[in-house]
């Protein structure tokens, strides 16, 4: 079993090519069967927050040295382990560095933590679409279209945890014009920056832009939900998709209104108001607990529109996972 693990070649210590240490020697891991559950364990072991992807290890520079060995053929984690060493492993059979595994974690230490403070998309439907605004010295500023690119939009979407950029180079509708000072123009992002503030740009506040040139960005925001473990799609333990990872919802404050929003969103009719005992028959989940203290009015069309703690922040165990039973 490996005695150490690290990620090499990424923008920060929480992404990169996976390397493990065996008998004092660092080597790579083959990507046979490498999946998000394996990455989740690795991220947990490194104190890097939630798993966000399983990129190929060859994306990270510099590549593994020819002399460096591939040490592990396959890792099979359930997703609940604390370290990679606790997962089933196969020593290497046949693998080249072209098949090195990679991992990407949220990296809670970075400036694009689950609650980024330096950038927002304002006046849009949800937090993943809107007018780009950047915070500087406690003041929110808009960003001029001049020099804006898809690469810059990618940085914003990643910084907000909103998936890939799907729309940029769009000017705001009149009702969405900013009223803030115009921050800057001539953004020059490579697309690999951790935050928009890391991109080179023109001087702060010095530009000839108008608010009708404010930048509007739309990100994928791949929020989804499902009910698992039931006899049909309309009953079971509730799981929500955030940043490409499925996780459960804690039952703190959960009630009838929250049930109704879930059933509505899934097109599953009305909530059958199950008893506490009925809710528990779907068992505990594994992996992430994404939401806690969800509060809905009952009028929302999506659970995402309800109030809740920041994604991934909770004081729950999987014994408190929410289950919902709808009329179907």
């Amino acid at each position: 079993s490996p005695s150490g693990v690290r990620l090499v070649g990424g923008l920060h210590r929480c992404e990169g090519r996976v390397e493990v240490e065996q008998k004092g020697q660092w080597g790579t891991v083959c990507d046979d069967g490498w999946d998000i559950k394996d990455v989740a364990v690795l991220c947990r072991e490194l104190g890097c927050g939630a798993a966000s992807g399983t990129p190929s290890g060859i994306l990270y520079e510099p590549p593994a040295e020819k002399e460096q060995k591939v040490l592990i053929q396959s890792v099979s984690c359930t997703g609940t382990e604390d370290t990679l060493a606790q997962c089933e492993q196969e020593e290497v059979y046949d693998c080249s560095h072209d098949e090195d595994a990679g991992a990407s974690c949220e990296n809670p230490e970075s400036s694009f933590s689950p609650v980024p403070e330096g950038v927002r998309l304002a006046d849009g439907p949800g937090h993943c679409k809107g007018r780009v605004e950047v915070k500087h010295q406690n003041q929110w500023y808009t960003v001029c279209q001049t020099g804006w690119s898809l690469r810059a939009a990618k940085v914003v979407c990643r910084q907000l945890g909103c998936g890939r950029a799907v729309l940029t180079q769009k000017r705001c509708n009149k009702h969405a014009y900013g009223r803030k000072p115009i921050w800057l123009s001539q953004m020059s992002c490579s697309g690999r920056e951790a935050t928009l503030q890391d991109c080179p740009s023109g001087p702060w506040g010095k530009n000839t832009c108008n608010h009708d040139e404010d930048t509007w960005v739309e990100c994928e925001d791949p929020f989804d939900l499902r009910l698992v473990g039931g006899d049909n799609l309309c009953s079971g333990r509730l799981e929500v998709l955030h940043k490409g990872v499925w996780g459960s919802v804690c039952d703190d404050n959960w009630g009838e209104k929250e049930d109704q929003v879930v059933c509505k969103q899934l097109g599953c009719g009305k909530s059958l108001s199950p008893s506490f005992r009925d809710r528990k028959c779907y068992g505990p989940g594994v992996g992430r607990i994404w939401l806690d203290n969800v509060r809905c009015s009952g009028e929302e069309q999506s659970l995402e529109q309800c109030q809740h703690r920041f994604w991934g922040f909770h004081d729950c165990t999987h014994q408190e996972d929410v289950a919902v039973i709808c009329s179907g």
């Epitope: 046979d32 196969e90 020593e91 046949d94 693998c95």
Partner: antibody
Framework: QSVEESGGRLVTPGTPLTLTCTVS????????INWVRQAPGKGLEWIGM??????TYYASWAKGRFIISRTSSTTVDLKMTSPTIEDTATYFC???????????WGQGTLVTVSS | ELDLTQTPSSVSAAVGGTVTINCQSS????????LSWYQQKPGQPPKLLIY???ALASGVSSRFSGSGSGTEFTLTISDVQCDDAATYYC????????????FGGGTEVEIK
């Protein structure tokens, strides 16, 4: 990419024999090499392998009877320590793994053990 | 150690028909389904048809298909042609504190 077996011949029982697998276009530090045999008119039988990590593995019946070793960056040997008449077969050297699309086999080399 | 039991040991098929060959493993070949199928003709080395239980090897006709997982696997040859006359082997790769490979006993396919 190719693999080729050599060293097969007629030997008497108990006389050690070494077969050699020569590879070209393959980096043995990345790829495993297996030895498989096939007795006349019979099925395929896995003997053992040397992994890309330079570790050897054997079928339980083959332990002690065969020794696999990497002798250079392009050759892997199979030593038959004390052949018996039942070891008469065509011996194949091959790169394969059931989880991979690549499969590369030599034409085989015939070993006949007879007194 | 891994044991693979192949059935039937021989089968006769008409041109245009379908042949099904089964392979049962003594233990699961793991979550990655390390099982492949080979075709061998007399005097030739085996030729890979299917890997990872169901993936078609490069250059192999789509008339060949593989299915199954865990311990039960199947090779299906549809629209059988004269050129399909050969012996077919399943091959499994298994890990248990070490690597093991094994072959099934083979199925001889004869074309009527």
């Amino acid at each position: 990419q190719s693999v080729e077996e050599s060293g097969g011949r007629l030997v008497t029982p108990g006389t050690p024999l070494t077969l050699t697998c020569t590879v070209s276009g393959i980096d043995l530090s990345n790829y495993a090499i297996n030895w498989v045999r096939q007795a006349p008119g019979k099925g395929l039988e896995w003997i053992g392998m040397i992994s890309s990590g330079d570790v050897t593995y054997y079928a339980s019946w083959a332990k002690g009877r065969f020794i696999i070793s990497r002798t250079s960056s392009t050759t892997v040997d199979l030593k038959m320590t004390s052949p018996t008449i039942e070891d008469t077969a065509t011996y194949f050297c091959a790169r394969f793994f059931a989880g991979r699309s690549e499969s590369l086999w030599g034409q085989g080399t015939l070993v006949t053990v007879s007194s | 150690e891994l044991d693979l039991t192949q059935t039937p040991s021989s089968v006769s098929a008409a041109v245009g028909g379908t042949v099904t060959i089964n392979c049962q493993s003594s233990q699961s070949v793991n979550k990655n389904n390390y099982l492949s199928w080979y075709q061998q003709k007399p005097g030739q080395p085996p030729k890979l048809l299917i890997y990872s239980a169901s993936a078609l090897a490069s250059g192999v006709s789509s008339r060949f298909s593989g299915s199954g997982s865990g311990t039960e696997f199947t090779l299906t040859i549809s629209d059988v042609q004269c050129d399909d006359a050969a012996t077919y082997y399943c091959q499994g790769t298994y890990y248990d504190s070490g690597w093991y490979n094994a072959f099934g006993g083979g199925t001889e396919v004869e074309i009527k």
